[in-house]
Amino acid sequence: VPRWRQQWSGPGTTKRFPETVLARCVKYTEIHPEMRHVDCQSVWDAFKGAFISKHPCNITEEDYQPLMKLGTQTVPCNKILLWSRIKDLAHQFTQVQRDMFTLEDTLLGYLADDLTWCGEFNTSKINYQSCPDWRKDCSNNPVSVFWKTVSRRFAEAACDVVHVMLNGSRSKIFDKNSTFGSVEVHNLQPEKVQTLEAWVIHGGREDSRDLCQDPTIKELESIISKRNIQFSCKNIYRPDKFLQCVKNPEDSSCTSEI
C-alpha cells in the first residue's frame, strides 16, 4: 500500500541534492585554502540533520546550528556586498572584484545557492516531489529558515562600509519583505557599521532618472538612519559599463582623461 505523502505547493528537493551539496563542498574547500580543514562528509551530515525526519513547516534556526558551526568562516568584514533581487550582477561583480564577498561566495551560501530541499516528519526520506512554499504553505520551511539564518549571521559580521545592490527595474526597489529588507538590514551592527551604501542598478539604457529619490529608497534611508548608521545611495546607470570599469580601471572611459 503506497504511503500517503504531503503535497506542498512548492517544487520538490533538487534532484541529486546530497551529491550536489557534497560535490560543492569539496570544490569550495579545494579552491579556498582557509577552508581546507573542513570535513565535507560532516558538513553533509549536519546539513541533513537540520531537516531530515522533521516536519518541513516546523524548522528552526536551532536545527541549523551544527551546520553553522562547521561552516564558520571569516570574511573581511569591510568587504561585504549584499544584494536584493539582482543576484546575477552581484555575483558577476564579485567574480571580478575578488576581494569583495556576497553570501554566496561563502561556503554555506555556495552550498545552498539555487537549491531546494525538505524532508518528511518521522521518515528519513528526502521529499523530491514537493516542498513548502513560503507564501502558500509556511515560512518556517527548511530553505527559508536556512537563508534567514545565514543571512542574519552574514549581516551581523559586517563592518565599516557595507554595500548593497538593488534592482532599479522593480516596482519596489527596496522591498521590506525581501531577505535584505526583513533580515539583513535589521542585523547590521551600528557599533561596527559606519555606512550602508546602496547601488541602484538601472535596467534601461536611456534611463537617467535618479532612482535614489525613489520612495522605497527613502524608506530604506529612514530605517538605516534610525539605527544610527549613515546611508549613501548611488545610481549605476549602465551596469555593463560599471563591470567594464571594475574589470579594467585603466580604460579611458573609466578614468579622468589627462
Epitope: 576581494d99 554595500h163 545610481n235 549605476i236 551596469p239 559599463k241 570599469c245 580601471p249 579622468s256 582623461e257
Partner: nanobody
Framework: QVQLVESGGGLVHTGGSLRLSCAAS????????MGWYRQAPGKQRELVAT???????RYADSVKGRFTISKDNAKNTVYLQMNSLKPEDTAVYYC????????????WGQGTQVTVSS
C-alpha cells in the same frame, strides 16, 4: 556641473606626512571614480591613486605602500593620506571626478601644492 574643492597641501620634510582632501558638489547621482593626479615642474601629469568605492582602488607603483586613498561616498569626498614622503613627491596634486556608469566628462580641481624638502 560638478565643483571640486581641494585642501591639505603644504610644505613637509622628507619622511613626513600630509593628508589631502577633495570635496565634490553639484549634480552627483551616479557612482563615480574620484582620485588624484600630480604634475611636477617640467613633467607630464601622472596618476597617483583613484577610488570607486571602498576596496576598488588603484595606485601608481611609485606610491604603493606609502599613500592610501579613501572615500566618503555619502559626502562625495576623497582623501589621500601621504606617508613617508620623498622629495620626488613634490608636485601640484589635482583632484579628479568622473561618473563611470554613463558617458560623462571628467572634472578637475584647481590643484594643491605639495612640497617635500630634504
Amino acid at each position: 556641473q560638478v565643483q571640486l574643492v581641494e585642501s591639505g597641501g603644504g610644505l613637509v620634510h622628507t619622511g613626513g606626512s600630509l593628508r589631502l582632501s577633495c570635496a565634490a558638489s553639484g549634480s552627483i547621482s551616479g557612482l563615480n571614480t574620484m582620485g588624484w593626479y600630480r604634475q611636477a615642474p617640467g613633467k607630464q601629469r601622472e596618476l597617483v591613486a583613484t577610488i570607486i568605492s571602498g576596496t576598488m582602488t588603484r595606485y601608481a607603483d611609485s606610491v604603493k605602500g606609502r599613500f592610501t586613498i579613501s572615500k566618503d561616498n555619502a559626502k562625495n569626498t576623497v582623501y589621500l593620506q601621504m606617508n613617508s614622503l620623498k622629495p620626488e613627491d613634490t608636485a601640484v596634486y589635482y583632484c579628479t571626478f568622473k561618473e563611470i556608469t554613463r558617458d560623462s566628462r571628467s572634472y578637475w580641481g584647481q590643484g594643491t601644492q605639495v612640497t617635500v624638502s630634504s
